[in-house]
């Protein structure tokens, strides 16, 4: 997260870290005791999932292995469309005040809605600085029409843009798959942005979760 702030401790109990060994690979969101939602581009053969801590590599955090993941069938590495994936945990999480599932959206929030994005991605760009603490940024949803002025045909129908006019605050490498939460519901998953990160008026781009609720529910049901 560029130009963000340290999240209030325990305020993001659904936030998970997908680790490759001990190293951050991507962010993710707990949606059920067995399931984590993340970006399709975060796909690996297996994952170490850290839950219940704002500190990356926290020894006291829950760590659960995951060996199965299900990318959206329409995902494209070329256009980045349908950048969404479900990761099935090998064992159920122990829910607590520090570990909770996020609420999936009932509807798509409108442009102008205030949201918070979080992650352990680099806080500087192009030189990288990975924080140990979970970082947050407050952003507003941007209409597809406005966002297309910047990204033209790169912006797919199920992509969501967020940012703050003239501000550098944005997502960056390592934040991928993490949550954009608006009015206590998951509206976006961090997908991509311009590089170097934090260029004013280049919105962050997210997968618009409200358009995938059916796919999420059906995939979880199929692979119970």
């Amino acid at each position: 997260i560029i130009d963000g702030y340290k999240c209030k401790e325990g305020s993001h109990p659904w936030q998970v870290a997908l680790l490759k060994g001990n190293q951050l690979h991507c962010g993710g969101v707990l949606v059920d005791k067995y399931w984590v939602l993340t970006a399709a581009h975060c796909k690996m053969g297996q994952y170490q999932v850290q839950l219940g801590s704002d500190k990356i590599g926290d020894q006291s955090a829950q760590k659960i292995k995951a060996t199965k993941s299900f990318r959206h069938p329409g995902y494209s590495t070329k256009t980045h469309v349908n950048d969404i994936m479900l990761v099935r945990l090998d064992e159920p999480v122990k829910m607590s005040s520090k570990v909770e599932a996020v609420q999936l959206p009932e509807h798509c929030e409108p442009p102008g809605t205030s949201c918070t994005v979080s992650g352990w991605g680099t806080t500087t760009s192009p030189d990288v600085t990975f924080p140990s603490d979970l970082m947050c940024s407050d952003v507003k949803l941007i209409s597809s029409r406005e966002c297309k002025k910047v990204y033209k045909d790169l912006l797919g129908k199920t992509m969501l843009c967020a940012g703050i006019p003239d501000s550098k605050t944005n997502t960056c490498n390592g934040d991928s798959g993490g949550p954009l939460v608006c009015n206590d519901t998951l509206q976006g998953l961090v997908s991509w942005g311009t590089y170097p990160c934090g260029q004013p008026n280049d919105p962050g781009v997210y997968t618009q979760v409200c358009k995938y609720k059916r796919w999420v529910m059906e995939t979880m049901k199929t692979h119970r």
């Epitope: 790169l154 490498n173 311009t194 280049d202």
Partner: antibody, heavy 128, light 107 residues
Framework: QVQLVQSGAEVKKPGASVKVSCKAS????????MHWVRQAPGQGLEWMGS????????NYAQKFQGRVTMTRDTSISTAYMELSRLRSDDTAVYYC?????????????????????WGQGTTVTVSS | EIVLTQSPGTLSLSPGERATLSCRAS???????LAWYQQKPGQAPRLLIY???SRATGIPDRFSGSGSGTDFTLTISRLEPEDFAVYYC????????FGGGTKVEIK
């Protein structure tokens, strides 16, 4: 294969403007920065600026601020460089060159910073 | 603005000899953001080295780059006839700048 094809040579009068085009093929145009570099006769390379084709964002060298405009048309994978208020010392070969990735995507945070593909160059002559 | 100074201005060597080209920055440059180019008369420049030491695609292994901070070096281990050209270093620190170039000519 990956290539950049530039528009033809131009002869301009002092005070006029010139617009050079650079058509990209063989790769995703919006995925990489496009730089413009010029070289006056017998001189070295001079970086003029760059454009991020994914967003249209630009970065110009101080020397050319206010005189150069870089744009892109993603529908035809083409970048443009317009230089106004031309002077005789703007006589040079103008190159477009592909730079590093223009978007971040995924966990990796290392990107190369080299101009790995160059156009053939466009000669601009400014003479009264 | 970071200024890059290349030396020597001209290097007169024979084929088979070793060429050592220097590039000095006016302030520290991250080695990730230093590149070297070769340019022959009437041609566009060609990327040789990026990230101070990584060879670009198709570049022979007689070309090598090294250095960090303010001092960087391009080495051509054994000069081939096609290596006689002008070499430029280039850095990125928000904005790009090129060095003035070193001409490698046949002695």
């Amino acid at each position: 294969q990956v290539q950049l094809v530039q528009s033809g040579a131009e002869v301009k009068k002092p005070g006029a403007s010139v617009k050079v085009s650079c058509k990209a093929s063989g790769y995703t145009f919006t995925g990489y920065y496009m730089h413009w570099v010029r070289q006056a006769p017998g001189q070295g390379l001079e970086w003029m600026g760059s454009i991020n084709p994914s967003s249209g964002g630009t970065n110009y060298a101080q020397k050319f601020q206010g005189r150069v405009t870089m744009t892109r048309d993603t529908s035809i994978s083409t970048a443009y460089m317009e230089l106004s208020r031309l002077r005789s010392d703007d006589t040079a070969v103008y190159y477009c060159a592909r730079g590093g990735p223009s978007t971040w995507y995924g966990g990796s945070a290392y990107y190369y910073y080299g101009m790995d593909v160059w156009g053939q160059g466009t000669t601009v002559t400014v003479s009264s | 603005e970071i200024v890059l100074t290349q030396s020597p201005g001209t290097l007169s060597l024979s084929p088979g000899e070793r060429a050592t080209l220097s590039c000095r920055a006016s302030q520290s440059v991250s080695s990730d953001y230093l590149a070297w180019y070769q340019q022959k008369p009437g041609q566009a420049p060609r990327l040789l080295i990026y990230g101070a030491s990584s060879r670009a695609t198709g570049i022979p292994d007689r070309f090598s780059g090294s250095g960090s901070g303010t001092d960087f070096t391009l080495t051509i281990s054994r000069l081939e006839p096609e290596d006689f050209a002008v070499y430029y270093c280039q850095q990125y620190a928000n904005l790009w700048t090129f060095g003035g170039g070193t001409k490698v000519e046949i002695k």
